[in-house]
């Protein structure tokens, strides 16, 4: 996250932290826990590394320099992709992992409400987006998990300024015209959460950007409300009932 | 320790096919990311085409596009690359590599095979 | 599909700093690799992600990056690191290569 502050415990309860372990182990993606074995993510964080095997997801965390070898963690059961993601294209860039043991919730670790589908009448006006991600483009993961409030851009005005590439409906956009703060590598996969009558949604996943916090350059984030059908569908049929934490 | 085996070269006509090898071993396999590179005779190296781990992804240098396949066989620890329509400037030592690839720092080869000479010639 | 261009030849007394170049496109916003290759043999990682060095590598290689050049830098230079450098950036599902430079120990 560029221009952000240190998030405190149980601010974000839903963040997760994708960490792959091959020789060393490094976080690589954020995620949001969406259900008790259920945790909402990016595809593109799996380009390139193995599905399964040398994942470790950490919840119910705040500052990754905490996790040491006796840290619990939860691996994956599986990952489902969406079958429309193709490698560096910015489409579809969702994808689920079921976790092999499902979470307890606590104050620290619980999901964060799912948007109806196909919304697009709420005006979101308090949105944020967290992660451990760089704080700039050629920085490094942080150890505390930072927040920044970012509002959100119309598709027109994010397209304007990505004449290069297609915003679809299917993408949101968030940034400053002058900059400053955004969301950044590894930041990926994290959630943008957005506060509408009290209660948190997750209006969309980190995807991507033309670099970081960059002068008109906004954050790019698959927009979950258009993928609801999907994800209840992937969730139901692997789960046979759905355990989303929907909206009231 | 890594070892990286490659074998499959030889002398092939134009037109001709060839199918390498890479055989791997001292890691997990089926971990990594793993790339096809070569080098013509004199010249600089060159890539060809690389393979995710689970074999779901490949992608080609547009020189090799439509001519050669990339594949995996993650039970057998080995890398492959089918090569038909073989012109003469396919010719070229062939090194298999083990890549180290993500989304955020991008791509690094740091272990090498020895290489297996291609020449295409009639 | 962005080049990556490298000065065909540099050379250098022993025990000076050898400096080769890599320029590109907007390379400084990419993470560059640096090969090391003696006649007669396989490419040797030597520089990844930019600055950092694989343990067997000696401390006397360092790279850097920024805006449209990296560099891969060899204080105290030695017979031994004569060889052929190549740089290497990774772009959009593409892996790309520099031509080479010969590092020439006078």
């Known amino acids: 996250i560029v221009g952000g502050t240190n998030s405190s415990w149980g601010e974000w309860p839903w963040q997760v932290s994708l960490q792959v372990k091959l020789t060393a182990q490094r976080h690589l993606c954020g995620g949001s826990l969406i259900g008790h074995q259920w945790v909402l993510t990016a595809a593109h964080c799996f380009d390139g590394l193995p599905l399964q095997d040398v994942w470790r997801i950490y919840s119910g965390i705040l500052n990754l320099s905490d996790i040491t070898k006796d840290t619990p963690f939860s691996q994956i059961k599986e990952i489902i992709i969406h079958q429309n993601y193709k490698v560096s294209e910015g489409n579809h860039d969702i994808a689920l992992i079921k976790l092999q043991a499902p979470l307890n919730y606590t104050e620290f670790q619980k999901p964060i409400c799912l948007p109806s589908k196909g919304d697009t009448s709420t005006i979101y006006t308090n949105c944020w987006v967290t992660g451990w991600g760089f704080s700039k483009e050629k920085g490094e993961i942080q150890n505390i998990l930072q927040k920044v409030n970012i509002p959100l851009v119309t598709n027109e005005e994010c397209q304007k300024r990505y004449q290069d590439y297609k915003i679809t409906q299917r993408m949101v956009c968030a940034g400053y015209k002058e900059g400053g703060k955004d969301a950044c590598k590894g930041d990926s996969g994290g959630p943008l959460v957005c506060k509408h009558n009290g209660m948190w949604r997750l209006v969309g996943i980190t995807s991507w950007g033309e670099g970081c916090a960059r002068r008109e350059q906004p954050g790019v984030y698959t927009k979950v409300a258009e993928y609801m059908d999907w994800i209840l569908e992937k969730t139901q049929s692997s789960d046979g009932k759905a355990q989303m934490q929907s909206p009231a | 320790e890594v070892q990286l085996l490659e074998s499959g070269g030889g002398l092939v006509q134009p037109g001709g096919s060839l199918r390498l090898s890479c055989a791997a071993s001292g890691f997990t396999f089926s971990w990594y990311t793993m790339v096809w590179v070569r080098q013509a005779p004199g010249k600089g190296l060159e890539w060809v085409s690389y393979?995710?781990?689970?074999?779901?992804?490949?992608f080609y240098a547009d020189s090799v596009k439509g001519r050669f396949t990339i594949s995996r066989d993650n039970s057998k620890n080995t890398l492959y690359l089918q090569m038909n329509s073989l012109r003469a400037e396919d010719t070229a030592v062939y090194y298999c590599?083990?890549?180290?690839?993500?989304?955020?720092?991008?791509?690094?080869?740091?272990?090498w095979g020895q290489g297996t000479l291609v020449t295409v010639s009639s | 599909q962005s080049a990556l261009t490298q000065p065909p030849t540099v050379s250098v007394s022993p025990g000076q700093t050898a400096r080769i170049t890599c320029s590109g496109n907007k390379l400084g916003d990419k993470y560059v690799a640096w090969y090391q290759q003696k006649p007669g043999q396989s490419p040797m990682l030597v520089i990844y992600q930019d600055t950092k060095r694989p343990s067997r590598v000696s401390e006397r290689f360092s790279g850097s990056n920024s805006a449209n050049t990296a560099t891969l830098s060899i204080s105290g230079t030695q017979a031994l690191d004569e060889a052929d450098y190549y740089c290497?950036?990774?772009?959009?599902?593409?892996?790309?290569f520099g031509g080479g430079t010969r590092l020439t120990v006078l």
């Open positions: 590599a083990m890549g180290s690839y993500d989304y955020i720092w991008g791509f690094y080869s740091d272990h």
């Open positions: 393979i995710y781990p689970s074999g779901g992804a490949t």
């Open positions: 290497q950036a990774w772009d959009s599902s593409i892996v790309i």
